[in-house]
Interface confidence: low
């Protein structure tokens, strides 16, 4: 053999119970000691430091802390140095060294030592990762190194977590013993933070020890707090809140159209939108993600705003008899009431739509003029004016006539036409045609679609001359022999005596 000792590097005992520290040692055979003695020291292997003596086989002198509490269970002659400590208290926790004493110079303090831990709570062992929905094994482990007192285990707060399975007394690698009870169950997210307890009691004593472990159950996020759809007025401040329940806390991300707007590792995340515009109208998604899964929810943001100035598309110039189609469109939220007016008369209206189609079948000259498209919702009103020009062949109006006054004949030719016509006065008896370009004889004045041309003839006539007025544009020509009326019907003042 050779100098050496074998004992557990660490051993535990409940306060008030006992502990048996298993120990074997060896020495060279050629020493052949007559008697083998031994000493147990506390906290230091070196005698010159005067460490407390736990047990000494040569004498009964021990340190006062160990008086009546230590005895040797092993037979030193058989190289067994097992030590029993009774009624252990916290101050007995520490390192225990054995020194073999074979007489003469042959004393040897072994470097191998045992660290005694005085405990007062069972050790609940929870796997490093407990995931909701995955079966887990939780164990309660207590030292069982006291031959005089055996612990019994029971679980506390395990209701609904399955029935415990008692494994009983197990020998650990270094020769120490533990009592073990197992609990198998499938944790839920609600079990996170749950306090699970284990109780060790010693029959026929009042000794009872409890230990607790809080379950750290990992589970994927569930979004638990989220705005319902949000309506906001353009220019207002909008706050979108997303809150998720998960363990560990999730990475919360606010997104829109695949763009990350804000993210943080937190239980809730506020997205602040300052002075919202219609461009920010849409669906916002909150994504909550951790290592165990993800959840996402969306919220619709509806930005309310007054209508934009309507745009008008369509035919603005039409020929009499054609069908005219005009589209007035705008953008607003909510959709507006769209109305098309002409001279304060409603021609067409539509409620809560962004487009209004105006159909004018077989347009007539009366349809010519200024129109308004008005868009209105509760946030405002915008209007756009547009002009429809109806083109048609000349129409000679009934007020066309001639009138004589002394030495002057004035003829009025009143024409409604679009585009503006050319007007000519024909005097068949004289075989003369006077065009409007001859300013000396003809004066023309236009008001809207009506052109009034006035022919002035000077000099005496035996009888009123025949005057034919002809009006012409690209859509046709119309002629009318102008009737003569009495002087009292003339529309101008007679000047002179």
């Amino acid at each position: 053999g050779h100098w050496g000792a074998w004992m557990p590097s660490s051993i535990s005992a409940f306060e008030g119970t006992c502990v048996s520290i298993p120990c074997r040692f060896d020495f060279p055979d050629e020493l052949r000691p007559a008697v083998v003695h031994g000493v147990w020291y506390f906290n230091s292997p070196y005698p010159k430091n005067y460490p407390p003596v736990v047990f000494k086989s040569r004498t009964q002198v021990v340190h006062e802390s160990f008086q009546g509490r230590s005895r040797l269970l092993g037979d030193l002659g058989l190289r067994n140095c097992t030590l029993l400590l009774s009624n252990v208290s916290p101050e007995l926790g520490g390192k225990y060294y054995f020194r073999g004493d074979l007489g003469g110079y042959n004393q040897y303090t072994f470097s191998e030592h045992s660290v005694l831990d005085i405990v007062n709570t069972p050790n609940i062992v929870v796997p490093p990762e407990v995931v909701a929905g995955t079966e887990v094994e939780v164990s309660c482990m207590v030292p069982d190194n006291c031959p005089e007192l055996r612990p019994e285990l029971s679980w506390l707060g395990h209701e609904g977590l399955g029935e415990p399975a008692v494994l009983g007394r197990l020998r650990e690698d270094e020769g120490t013993w533990v009592q073990v009870s197992l609990l198998h169950f499938v944790p839920t997210r609600e079990a996170n933070g749950h306090r699970l307890g284990c109780q060790a009691s010693f029959p026929n004593t009042t000794l009872q020890f409890e230990g607790y472990a809080s379950m750290d159950v990992k589970y994927p996020p569930v979004i638990v707090e989220m705005n319902s759809s949000v309506e906001a007025i353009e220019g207002s401040h909008v706050s979108l809140l997303c809150g998720a329940d998960s363990n560990p806390p999730p990475l919360l991300t606010w997104m829109r159209d695949g763009t990350v707007l804000r993210e943080a590792v937190a239980e809730s995340l506020l997205l602040e939108l300052e002075e919202v515009t219609p461009a920010e109208d849409g669906v916002y998604a909150c994504l909550a993600e951790n290592a165990y899964g993800q959840d996402n929810r969306t919220v619709g943001l509806s930005v309310m705003y007054a209508p934009w100035k309507p745009t008008v598309n369509g035919t603005m110039v039409a020929v009499e008899g054609e069908t005219v189609s005009i589209l007035c469109s705008t953008q607003s939220n909510p959709d507006p009431i769209l109305t098309i007016f002409k001279e304060k008369q409603i021609l067409s209206t539509v409620i809560y739509e962004s487009e209004l189609q105006l159909e004018l079948p077989a347009v007539s000259p009366e349809d010519d003029g200024e129109y308004w498209c008005v868009a209105e919702n509760q946030y405002g009103q915008r209007a756009t004016a547009f002009n429809l020009s109806v083109e048609f062949a000349p129409v000679l109006l009934l007020e066309s006539h001639c009138a004589a006054a002394r030495d002057t004949v004035q003829c009025l030719c009143v024409v409604k036409s679009n585009p503006e016509p050319s007007v000519a006065f024909e005097l068949p008896s004289r075989n003369v045609t006077v065009n409007e370009s001859e300013r000396e004889f003809v004066y023309s004045e236009r008001s809207g679609l009506v052109l009034t041309s006035i022919l002035t003839l000077r000099g005496q006539a035996q009888a009123p001359p025949r005057v034919i007025c002809t009006a012409r544009n690209l859509y046709g020509a119309k002629s009318l022999e102008l009737p003569f009326q009495g002087a009292h019907r003339l529309m101008w003042a007679k000047i002179g005596p």
Epitope: L251, E263, V265
Partner: antibody, heavy 126, light 112 residues
Framework: EIQLVQSGPELKKPGETNKISCKAS????????MNWVKQAPGKGLKWMGW????????TYADDFTGRFAFSLETSASTAYLQISNLKNEDTATYFC???????????????????WGQGTLVTVSS | NIMMTQSPSSLAVSAGEKVTMSCKSS????????????LAWYQQKPGQSPKLLIY???TRESGVPDRFTGSGSGTDFTLTIINVHTEDLAVYYC????????FGTGTKLEIK
């Protein structure tokens, strides 16, 4: 006006302890971290680390662990650098410099030092 | 740690001239998440503390004359001073703030 005013020059012996102060004004002290930068005579700049003025958590560069300690007196808007067991090689000018603190930590903002103290010369000589 | 190497270590130019100095990093300081280069330039005049000139490689700090321009990306960066003034006499340091913070070796600008 934003200012970082440091304590005056110090002459120390090896083995002694030195504490430099850096008083901030003109801004919210806890919105900006405080860095410490060493400049040995005629040498370049060497970052020593920084202290989060909001949480009080210090971060030390690899070469400045052990003898170096950053601390705060938030109520006085003052940061401190303490060097214990001074060595000759600690002779240098020490600058404090502020940097924005990113509270959210997701979008990485970096630590750009925009305002610096005037520097404190520490001379270690026996 | 990321090593920052500046060149030249010193240079002398006449007032009104243009000067260019280089800074190379041992690893890229371009952060892919935001496509920003975590590089700053500082000016340290004799007997003074450093002054921030440029950050994000090319953003000029407010109050810095537009004679100073930063450029580059990844590992190679340049500070250019056009129309050098006599008050530009200083040591210029590049500085990366992506990893544990490090400064360049410095470029000393002297005026002839």
């Amino acid at each position: 006006e934003i200012q970082l005013v440091q304590s005056g020059p110090e002459l120390k012996k090896p083995g002694e302890t030195n504490k430099i102060s850096c008083k901030a004004s003109g801004y919210t002290f806890t919105n900006y971290g405080m860095n410490w930068v060493k400049q040995a005579p005629g040498k370049g700049l060497k970052w020593m680390g920084w202290i989060n003025t909001y949480t009080g958590e210090p971060t030390y560069a690899d070469d400045f662990t052990g003898r170096f300690a950053f601390s705060l007196e938030t109520s006085a808007s003052t940061a401190y650098l303490q060097i214990s067991n001074l060595k000759n090689e600690d002779t240098a000018t020490y600058f404090c410099a502020r940097n924005p603190i990113n509270y959210y930590g997701i979008n990485y903002e970096g630590y750009v030092m925009d305002y610096w103290g005037q520097g404190t010369l520490v001379t270690v000589s026996s | 740690n990321i090593m920052m190497t500046q060149s030249p270590s010193s240079l002398a130019v006449s007032a009104g001239e243009k000067v260019t100095m280089s800074c190379k990093s041992s690893h890229s300081v371009l952060y892919s998440s935001n496509q920003k280069n975590y590089l700053a330039w500082y000016q340290q005049k004799p007997g003074q503390s450093p002054k921030l000139l440029i950050y994000w490689a090319s953003t000029r700090e407010s109050g810095v004359p537009d004679r100073f321009t930063g450029s580059g990306s990844g590992t190679d960066f340049t500070l250019t001073i056009i129309n050098v003034h006599t008050e530009d006499l200083a040591v210029y340091y590049c500085h990366q703030y992506l990893s544990s913070l490090t400064f360049g070796t410095g470029t000393k600008l002297e005026i002839k």
